[in-house]
């Protein structure tokens, strides 16, 4: 089939595509805040089939301002064009759109994690989904940052296989009775801007020497 490519792009909305817990989440905001839709419908096309305009079933007539596209957007080699329609009742208020290349436009949100402090080490438990699609791995590296008294150390644990299930990393050779903070994030091979998690901090318990010193006082 030959076609002039439909011009779907227009910038009256801002869109963001994020990998959140290894799910592709598209979120949007309206630039004109005086428009208040009661619901949205999200559609998209692919550059190789630009005359088609597929409705995202789980984001048709939705009141949310985000949409999970994990099961729809699979290819990092395909350009996607989203079309967002906003409605008030049965009236269409607007239609806006944006082009995406997942490999370029995806931002990677940090995974959930917990820390437990011991005398001279910290266990960092990173929570990944139990199953992660191969194409959503994106050549990502896990980075764990340890901060104490103004010094930042980067740890890049090697994860065998893909990032799925829970993963525990031990930051060792730490100083007892010291405050440590930990941040976790995903780093992409293309050196895109990273999104670091908020810091989680723990004061390590005192070691044996300081305990005996305390009791000698």
């Amino acid at each position: 089939i030959s076609y002039d490519s439909p011009d779907y792009t227009d910038e009256s909305c801002t869109f963001k595509i994020s990998l959140r817990n290894f799910r592709s989440i598209l979120s949007w905001e309206l630039k004109n805040h005086s428009i208040v839709p009661t619901h949205y419908t999200l559609l998209y096309t692919i550059m190789s089939k630009p005359e088609d305009l597929k409705v995202v079933k789980n984001c048709a007539n939705t009141t949310r301002s985000f949409c999970d596209l994990t099961d729809e957007w699979r290819s990092t080699h395909e350009a996607y064009v989203t079309v967002l329609e906003g409605f008030s009742g049965n009236t269409t208020l607007f239609s806006c759109s944006h082009n995406f290349w997942l490999a370029i436009d995806m931002s990677f949100e940090p995974p959930e994690f917990e820390i437990v402090g011991f005398t001279n080490h910290i266990n960092v438990m990173v929570k990944f989904p139990s199953i992660v699609e191969e194409e959503l791995q994106f050549d990502l590296s896990l980075v764990i940052e340890e901060q104490s008294e103004g010094i930042v150390k980067k740890h890049k644990p090697e994860i065998k296989g893909n990032m799925s299930g829970n993963f525990t990393y031990i930051i060792d050779k730490l100083i007892p009775n010291t405050n440590y903070c930990v941040s976790v994030y995903l780093e992409h091979s293309d050196e895109q801007a990273v999104i670091k998690s908020p810091l989680k901090c723990t004061l390590l318990p005192p070691g044996q020497e300081s305990e005996s010193a305390e009791s000698a006082k």
Epitope: D52, K54, V55
Partner: nanobody, 117 residues
Framework: QVQLQESGGGLVQPGGSLRLSCAAS????????MKWVRQPPGKGLEWVST????????RYAESVKGRFTISRDNAKNTLYLQLNSLKTEDTAMYYC??????????RGQGTQVTVSS
């Protein structure tokens, strides 16, 4: 199985108008984007226009922009294409189809539009 039946074609002089219809059945018409494509004599299929389920988003090929209007009536399960200011190069067999690559469908028999003086 998606069923589509086009109608409304005919012989018209340059500058004239026609309104094509496409009656849809066997699927939930109101949930899908729809499109018109055409096949000029001896050529391949060309995309003409696309409309979203609500009708809120419409797109046109450059060659028909400003002359053709796509619309739909979800209550009647019908897709329309209004053809104005027709030119000889609009002569073609016109087909409607679901604008969704994941939908298995057979093309209807089409409706012939001939623009000639």
């Amino acid at each position: 199985q998606v069923q589509l039946q086009e109608s409304g074609g005919g012989l018209v002089q340059p500058g004239g108008s026609l309104r094509l219809s496409c009656a849809a059945s066997e699927f939930t018409f109101s949930e899908y984007s729809m499109k018109w494509v055409r096949q000029p004599p001896g050529k391949g299929l060309e995309w003409v226009s696309t409309i979203s389920p609500s009708g809120g988003t419409t797109r046109y090929a450059e060659s028909v922009k400003g002359r053709f209007t796509i619309s739909r009536d979800n209550a009647k399960n019908t897709l329309y294409l209004q053809l104005n200011s027709l030119k000889t190069e609009d002569t073609a067999m016109y087909y409607c189809s679901v604008a969704d690559w994941s939908v298995t469908q057979r093309r209807g028999q089409g409706t012939q539009v001939t623009v000639s003086s």
